[in-house]
């Protein structure tokens, strides 16, 4: 009896594992074995496929082939027993644009109120994504054990941080890896469960902002507590990317070492043009807090984004704001000839129930005012260049008392 | 492991153009700071300048208007061109790295140029 | 620019001992300073930088102190492998400027 070829071959590559897939065409013939060729583009002859000879199964695997993975190849099978069957020549593919991304490699720690995320592929020195190690973004959903509500969290790098957990919780997420450049969404990762801390006795201090002032930066934050001593690191950004870095290290900045106010001041000149991470440490010389939320700083944006500056008109039912250029040193206004689109906050002083205009104009009308109430207001400015996409930090609070009622002309 | 080297000419004459090529194995010139730095006969060093991760860079003012320095990320390369060159030139010259702040914590062996008529 | 000061230019000791190299800047660099061994022939490496902070693999004789425009580095129990030239180096303003060095020979 002639045998019959198989059919229905699948070619399934996930990192840097190739595993063949068949039907057999005949199950009622026993002991029938199968075995494939490959060919390279441009070449006439056909080579034996290593690992994938006189197979018994209907899968293979054939990792060990070390090929081009941009190099596009063909492949054909056939059953053999006495005799063998014709060949099936399967669709010629690129192993590269096949491939998938397999689950990365999860590691988690646990603080109070923050889960840091270290995530890495899940094959080492993988030979299909060689050329793109430094390109993986990470997605992740998470969850709170108990509820189920699931959160997702997009475009992260290896090591990452989820903030504003609640202490002693039991959270547990998943991960996939993406190729934005390729197009290419991995598949997920096993589930990891870790359970928060027990809530530290020293919160991480809070609203972290950097601004300009003469040749310096102004690096301050928010503490609960008085008589605490503070320390600030930075991390060049680009190391959050790269997983293996041995060159991945907190570092110190001296003039913010052990200072015993909440705020700190170094030279614009320190650091080398790019994007920093800073984070602040609160201590009491016997605790010591978890570290704050790590914020961005873009030394050649934040040395010419300043803060505007602004005055109000105060009428009963609204306030004018008129908004001008920022000032430098010497007080001498800064000319930022790009275009700025304003935000500005504004709430009752005696609330903190507060309420944002997005206004790319410099006179602004603040509506809805009550008489003879006083309101703050602070504002910053965005680019609206979209590759430039920074925005200052918020100017000082300004407050005002509103005019008595009728005198809104 | 993080590895530069040098390579150059070794002998320039006085107004040539200066070319030195620092090659960095083991680690991308896409991430970080490229530095150069040179140690004249009297062992005084004069840091020269870099070029960074996105390709800014920055000069030292009293090199300003003969220095430059380029980079080929394909070759994980990046370049030094000092033009005019003198006497005063004379020095061995140091590639480096460093990672957001001017201390440098890996460096090449060095190149040595003579400048001489 | 800031100018570094270093001294002495040179010092003889001998194994075991230990001596203290110093550093004088023209202006307060707020401990933003390296300190970097350069023995014959070889490139210079990074001992210390933010003036206290041994860099990764440097062993824990050495050590850097100081504040304002003085600074200095101190190596205990000298080993033979420690002998050869020290600079320091700030870098709180640019361009960043270094020491003249200091020679640490055997006795």
């Known amino acids: 009896k002639n045998l019959k070829s198989p059919q229905k071959v699948e070619v399934d590559i996930i990192d840097d594992n190739f595993i063949l897939r068949w039907n057999r065409s005949d199950e009622s013939v026993g002991n029938v074995t199968f075995s494939f060729d490959y060919q390279k583009t441009g070449m006439d002859n056909w080579i034996k496929l290593s690992g994938c000879q006189n197979i018994t199964s209907t899968k293979c695997n054939f990792s060990s082939l070390k090929l081009n993975v941009y190099e596009e190849i063909k492949l054909r099978i056939r059953a053999e027993k006495e005799n063998t069957s014709s060949w099936y020549e399967v669709d010629s593919f690129t192993p590269f644009r096949k491939a998938q991304i397999g689950p990365p490699e999860v590691h988690l720690e646990a603080e109070d109120k923050a889960i840091v995320i270290h995530i890495s592929p899940g094959t080492k020195d993988s030979v299909m994504w060689a050329l793109d190690g430094l390109s993986f973004t990470y997605s992740l959903v998470i969850w709170k054990n108990s509820s189920g509500v699931e959160e997702r969290i997009e475009n992260i790098y290896s090591r990452h941080k989820i903030y504003k957990l609640s202490p002693e919780t039991t959270y547990c997420l998943k991960v996939k890896a993406a190729l934005l450049t390729s197009w290419k969404i991995g598949v997920y990762s096993p589930v990891h469960c870790i359970k928060t801390t027990v809530e530290n006795e020293l919160p991480p201090p809070e609203n972290i902002e950097v601004s300009v002032q003469n040749q310096n930066y102004v690096l301050k934050w928010d503490y609960t507590y008085a008589n605490m001593t503070f320390q600030v690191q930075w991390l060049h950004a680009f190391l959050k990317r790269n997983p293996g870095n041995h060159l991945y290290k907190w570092k110190q900045i001296p003039d913010c070492e052990n200072v015993k106010t909440t705020q700190c001041v170094f030279p614009q000149n320190v650091f080398q043009k790019g994007i920093y991470l800073l984070r602040v440490q609160a201590s009491d010389g016997n605790n010591t807090s978890f570290w704050s939320e790590e914020i961005k700083f873009d030394t050649e944006i934040q040395a010419f984004l300043l803060p505007p500056v602004f005055n109000i008109r105060s009428l009963s039912d609204s306030f004018h704001i008129y908004i001008g250029a920022p000032k430098q040193s010497g007080n001498t206004p800064v000319i930022q000839d790009y275009p700025l689109i304003y935000e500005i906050i504004f709430w009752e002083n005696t609330s903190n129930a507060e309420r944002k205009i997005i206004e790319k104009k410099t006179d602004v009308t603040v509506p809805n005012l009550k008489p003879l109430t006083v309101y703050c207001v602070k504002a910053r400015a965005h680019t609206m260049d979209e590759k430039l996409n920074k925005s200052s930090v918020f100017s000082d609070a300004v407050c005002e008392k509103t005019k008595p009622g009728n005198t809104s002309k | 492991e993080v590895q530069l080297q040098e390579s150059g000419p070794g002998l320039a004459k006085p107004s040539q153009t200066l070319s030195l090529t620092c090659s960095v194995t083991?680690?991308?010139?896409?991430?970080?700071?490229w530095n150069w730095i040179r140690k004249f006969p009297g062992n005084k060093l004069e840091y020269m300048g870099y070029?960074?991760?996105?390709?800014?860079?920055y000069y030292n003012p009293s090199l300003k208007s003969r220095i430059s320095i380029t980079r080929d990320t394909s070759k994980n390369q990046y370049y030094l061109q000092l033009n005019s060159v003198t006497n005063e030139d004379t020095a061995t010259y140091y590639c480096?790295?460093?990672?957001?702040?001017?201390?440098?914590?890996?460096w090449g062996q060095g190149t040595t140029l003579t400048v001489s008529s | 620019d800031i100018q570094m000061t270093q001294s002495p230019a040179s010092l003889s000791a001998s194994v075991g001992e230990t001596v203290t190299i110093t550093c004088r800047a023209s202006g307060n660099i707020h401990n933003y300073l390296a300190w970097y061994q350069q023995k014959q022939g070889k490139s210079p490496q990074l001992l210390v930088y933010n003036a206290k902070t041994l860099e990764d693999g440097v062993p824990s004789r050495f050590s850097g102190s100081g504040s304002g425009t003085q600074y200095s580095l101190k190596i205990n129990s000298l080993q033979p492998e420690d002998f050869g030239s020290y600079y320091c180096?700030?870098?709180?303003?640019?361009?960043?400027?270094f020491g003249s060095g200091t020679k640490l020979e055997i006795k």
């Open positions: 083991g680690y991308s010139i896409t991430s970080d700071y």
């Open positions: 480096a790295r460093s990672g957001g702040m001017y201390y440098f914590d890996y």
């Open positions: 070029i960074s991760y996105s390709g800014s860079i």
């Open positions: 180096q700030h870098f709180w303003s640019i361009p960043p400027t």
